[in-house]
């Protein structure tokens, strides 16, 4: 059989984005087809598909590190360490590291994607017209400061969390990890990996900013990608952080 | 202890970090603040961290090199190479490979950085704003040579710094430095170590074009960072031509 | 030696890099310059070596599989596989892995320089011109739909297409490689790899698009650069296809 | 240092036209420097006329009905404004004045040299 | 095209004085790109050409004594003359260079008492 281990992520990976891609697809093309006539079929190959990359990387970042909650509140329920795990939360576990390279993977293609969207003809073609419209509405100054903020910093999350997941991969590579001792291997695999989750969620929030309450954003009374994509990582660090309450953590670390 | 051969690197790249923060905040943000009320504050989380990132990459890579260049100092010095190097400058040579590694993952942050900037929204403003005020100057033509042909040469140049950089950062992964000879390695290490080094150089020197003897860009009396990033590249390099020199060569090789 | 196995695939890329190169310099900068007098050599640092790169990426990449091809040819012909290659194939078979490499090396660089477009100062005072154009020609609306469509679509491809490459270069290597099966191993250096030179060559073809029947583009009575990068892997795709025709593939399977 | 002469002025029929002048020495008018004329009437206060930019490209103030000109001869170092259909309301000292090039972190800035002025007088 | 309003016309006021100019703008003059206004102030005496003050709203031209400075920001600004000098007795005049046509107030004509 071929990738034992890379059977679970991929189908994991296949069913959001598809999921996603179709969601996208109806929020952002089907809808203004059906509402108003407008063709937006030309978002397809960049600007759907980069709304999906970043939901289904978040997503696997968020299960590489759901087992372990899920996993400590089984130990704390059961009182000790030597009851065995149920075997689908086995099978999880033994493919984290699947999961979390599947996220990078899918991280820098986002990435590449994002960094793509200004070489665009219709990039250009929209700038062109913003410009005649400002002229035409003899508006000298086009900055919307509360705008600018919001994507200075979450450009700049972004590419931060990136760097880490790409340090967390090139650990992954057999021989480097085998230079690591496992306590700096469990280390950056653990410490750095909740980095990295945190700043991407921090990240997706950023994105948000304000289109929470924008009734807009809420086409067909469907919340945007970014609702839905922050929140299992967003559990998944709350478990974590309650997890690493003094009290919970000692209780852990005797199991 | 954790990741021992990897302290001296981080902690001489945190301060270079810091440092090169504070002063470019300085420069860039407290400056404009205190002479004139201009509120820079959105420049902090792209193009302040921007202006951090090449100056350590560039140092830490001269730093890569420098330990070489005071070794063969040494030798010279002392006429044998069976001399024991002073403890700072041992621990420095064995500590090579990961200020290499670090410059380069500087240098992949400040690419991604770099190209980021064109997809920011305050990017896009500004756009709009020349757009407009080009109109409003019934000018027809924007183009400004001599700032065409610095900015397509360093770009380049980068780029190509950076892609050597990447091969020897990928000739580090353990497996395949050990699929290479001794020699193979050491030619690698070496000599495309420096020509990277010698492309960043110009890359940065490029960068500053005519802004050496630009009066604005002295701000409160102090330099532009490429002047001081340039700095200690430019030594490294000058001696590295010094001991290629036949005469020191020679005397070296015999050593 | 240094390298013996790169030897070749260096070379045959020196070789396609230079002539490439001057073939772009002389449609792209010389025949302006001897024609109208227009001044274009700053497109050299950038435009020209972007021209270059994916041009020796796609070529390099059909000749890692075009050697199978021959093989297959070969064996069929022979009616055996126990009859020993020539030993240029022989040589050419075992340098594959090396082709593939600096196929992915160039196609990296052609990814950076691509996403570097729009930061060039070139680039900005071109667009505030044709913002500018658009304003004196009162011209609403600059979008120009099958163009926006052609650049969205090979966009997607590319970074795809490159994504792909970057997993089999990750795959060699070698204590990835090691870590994998014959088998997975051979699945995706076979079956991904000619994924990815299809998705390299439609991508060229879609960035043609309708410059096939462009009088404009016959500069000199020479063919724009696509229309010769597209024939090898073109070629190299046809025959793949039909060696895995059914009738044909149970033949090569016997043998 | 930069000394802006201006000349040319003097008394002329309404409907006439006029040429001022104003040479430029100490600084090329190629250079990085834009070039403006501004005019003021008796006891008023001053207007813009227009600029010519160190790359050749001009602009006006509207309200003149594109009844003035200006260009420049870079061999000379002299700026021109060419005054056509006089008025007698465009009776002024008329001023050209130096602003830096337009830049693109800056965008404008103020005059900072002027010329002393010459007197142009319309009157029948 | 962009307003620009002095107050008051004119003032009369003797040596050591604090003088306070004003300028209104129609429209804001601050960039906010640039975080810059678009407001100079010029000094002009009787026969003589305008000579520049202050530029970007509270930038001193060098040369210019201390005593002068410029505040405001958006619409509204001020020039103060924190001790009036035998030599500050002229008009000024307050210009804005946010746009095209660029446009200046009416002027202040600063008096002896």
């Known amino acids: 059989e071929l990738f034992p281990q890379w059977h679970l992520p991929i189908k994991i990976a296949a069913i959001i984005a598809s999921l996603t891609f179709l969601y996208t697809l109806l929020r952002e093309v089907i809808h203004p087809l059906a509402t108003s006539h407008q063709q937006y079929f030309y978002k397809i190959p960049i600007l759907v598909i980069n709304k999906v990359l970043p939901m289904v990387s978040i997503t696997l970042l968020a299960l590489v590190y759901l087992p372990g909650v899920i996993a400590a509140i089984v130990q704390l329920h059961n009182g000790t360490k030597y009851k065995k795990f149920p075997h689908w939360l086995d099978k999880w576990m033994l493919t984290r590291k699947q999961f979390g390279l599947l996220s990078f993977f899918f991280a820098v293609l986002h990435a590449i994607y994002s960094l793509s969207y200004p070489m665009r003809r219709s990039y250009r073609y929209k700038l062109l017209n913003w410009a005649y419209q400002q002229v035409q509405q003899n508006k000298e100054d086009a900055w919307i400061e509360h705008d600018v903020w919001r994507m200075e910093i979450y450009v700049s999350l972004g590419i931060v969390g990136l760097a880490i997941l790409a340090l967390l991969a090139v650990t992954s590579i057999p021989s480097v990890s085998d230079s690591l001792t496992w306590r700096e291997f469990h280390y950056i695999q653990s410490k750095l990996g909740i980095v990295s989750l945190l700043l991407g969620t921090i990240h997706a929030l950023i994105f948000a900013w304000n289109k929470w309450i924008d009734i807009k954003q809420f086409v067909w009374y469907t919340p945007p990608t970014f609702m839905i994509a922050v929140f299992l990582p967003v559990v998944v660090l709350i478990f974590k952080s309650i997890l690493f309450l003094p009290c919970l953590r000692k209780k852990i670390l005797k199991i | 202890e954790l990741f021992p051969q990897w302290h001296l690197p981080i902690k001489i790249a945190a301060i270079i970090a810091s440092l090169t923060f504070l002063y470019t905040l300085l420069r860039e943000v407290i400056h404009p603040l205190a002479t004139s009320h201009q509120q820079y504050f959105y420049k902090i989380p792209i193009l302040v961290i921007n202006k951090v990132l090449p100056m350590v990459s560039i140092t830490l890579l001269a730093l890569v090199y420098l330990p070489g260049v005071i070794a063969a100092i040494v030798q010279l010095h002392n006429g044998t190479k069976y001399k024991k190097f002073p403890h700072w400058l041992d621990k420095w040579m064995l500590t090579r490979k990961q200020f290499g590694l670090l410059s380069f993952f500087f240098a992949v942050l400040h690419a991604i950085y770099s190209l980021s900037y064109p997809m920011r929204r305050s990017y896009r403003y500004k756009l709009l704003n020349w757009a407009y005020q080009q109109v409003q100057q019934n000018k027809e033509d924007a183009w400004i040579e001599h700032d065409v042909w610095r900015m397509e040469i360093y770009v380049s140049l980068g780029i190509v710094g950076l892609a050597i950089l990447a091969l020897l950062a990928v000739t580090s992964i353990p497996s395949v430095s050990d699929s290479l000879t001794w020699r193979e390695f050491h030619y690698i290490q070496s000599k495309l170590g420096i020509v990277s080094l010698l492309l960043g150089t110009i890359h940065a020197l490029i960068f500053a074009w005519n802004k050496w003897i630009d009066i604005k860009q002295f701000v409160w009396y102090t330099p532009p960072t490429f002047m001081i990033a340039v700095f200690l590249p430019v030594v490294v390099l000058i001696f590295k031509s010094i001991l290629f020199l036949p005469c020191l060569r020679k005397k070296i090789l015999k050593i | 030696e240094l390298f013996p196995q790169w030897h070749l695939p260096i070379k045959i890329a020196a070789i396609i890099a230079s002539l490439t190169f001057l073939y772009t310099l002389l449609r792209e900068v010389i025949h302006p310059l001897a024609t109208s007098h227009q001044q274009y050599f700053y497109k050299i640092p950038i435009l020209v070596i972007n021209k270059v790169l994916p041009m020796v990426s796609i070529t390099l990449l059909a000749l890692v599989y075009l050697p199978g091809v021959i093989a297959a040819i070969v064996q069929l012909h022979n009616g055996t596989k126990y009859k020993k290659f020539p030993h240029w194939l022989d040589k050419w078979m075992l340098t594959r892995k090396q082709f593939g490499l600096l196929s992915f090396f160039f196609a990296v660089l052609h990814a950076i320089y691509s996403l570097s477009y729009p930061m060039r100062r070139s680039y900005r005072y071109k667009l505030l011109n044709w913002a500018y154009q658009q304003v004196q020609q009162n011209k609403e609306d600059a979008w120009i739909e099958h163009d926006v469509w052609r650049m969205e679509i090979y966009v997607s491809l590319g970074i795809v297409g490159l994504a792909i490459l970057a997993l089999l270069a990750v795959t060699s290597i070698p204590s990835v490689s090691d870590s994998l099966t014959w088998r997975e191993f051979h699945y995706i250096q076979s079956k991904l790899g000619i994924v990815s030179l299809l998705l390299g060559t439609i991508h060229a073809l879609i960035f043609a698009w309708n410059k096939w029947i462009d009088i404009k583009q016959f500069v000199w009575y020479t063919p724009p650069t696509f229309m010769i990068a597209v024939f090898l892997p073109v070629v190299v795709l046809i025959f793949k296809s039909i060696l895995f025709l059914p009738c044909l593939r149970k033949k090569i399977l016997k043998i | 240092e930069v000394q802006l002469v201006e000349s040319g002025g003097g008394l002329v029929q309404p409907g006439g036209s006029l040429r001022l002048s104003c040479a430029v020495s100490?600084?090329?008018?190629?250079?990085?420097?834009?070039w403006n004329w501004v005019r003021q009437a008796p006891g008023k206060g001053l207007e813009w006329v227009g600029y010519?930019?160190?790359?050749?490209?001009?602009s006006y103030n509207p309200s003149l009905k594109s009844r003035f000109t200006i260009s420049r001869d870079n061999s000379k170092n002299t700026l021109y404004l060419q005054m056509n259909s006089l008025r007698a309301e465009d009776t002024a000292v008329y001023y050209c004045?130096?602003?830096?090039?337009?830049?693109?972190?800056?965008?404008?800035?103020?005059?900072?040299?002027w010329g002393q002025g010459t007197l142009v007088t319309v009157s029948s | 095209d962009i307003q620009m309003t002095q107050s008051p016309s004119s003032l009369s006021a003797s040596v050591g004085d604090r003088v306070t100019i004003t300028c209104k703008s129609s429209q804001s003059l601050l960039y906010r790109s640039n975080q810059k206004n678009y407001l100079a102030w010029y000094q002009q005496k009787p026969g003589k050409a305008p000579k520049l003050l202050i530029y970007w709203a509270s930038t001193r031209e060098s040369g210019v004594p201390s005593r002068f400075s410029g505040s405001g920001s958006g619409t509204d600004f001020t020039l103060t003359i924190s001790s009036l000098q035998p030599e500050d007795f002229a008009t000024y005049y307050c210009q804005q260079y946010y746009n095209y046509p660029r446009t200046f107030g009416q002027g202040t004509k600063v008096e002896i008492k």
């Open positions: 100490g600084y090329s008018i190629t250079s990085d420097y834009a």
């Open positions: 004045a130096r602003e830096r090039n337009y830049d693109y972190d800056d965008y404008y800035y103020a005059m900072d040299y």
């Open positions: 010519i930019s160190n790359s050749g490209s001009t």
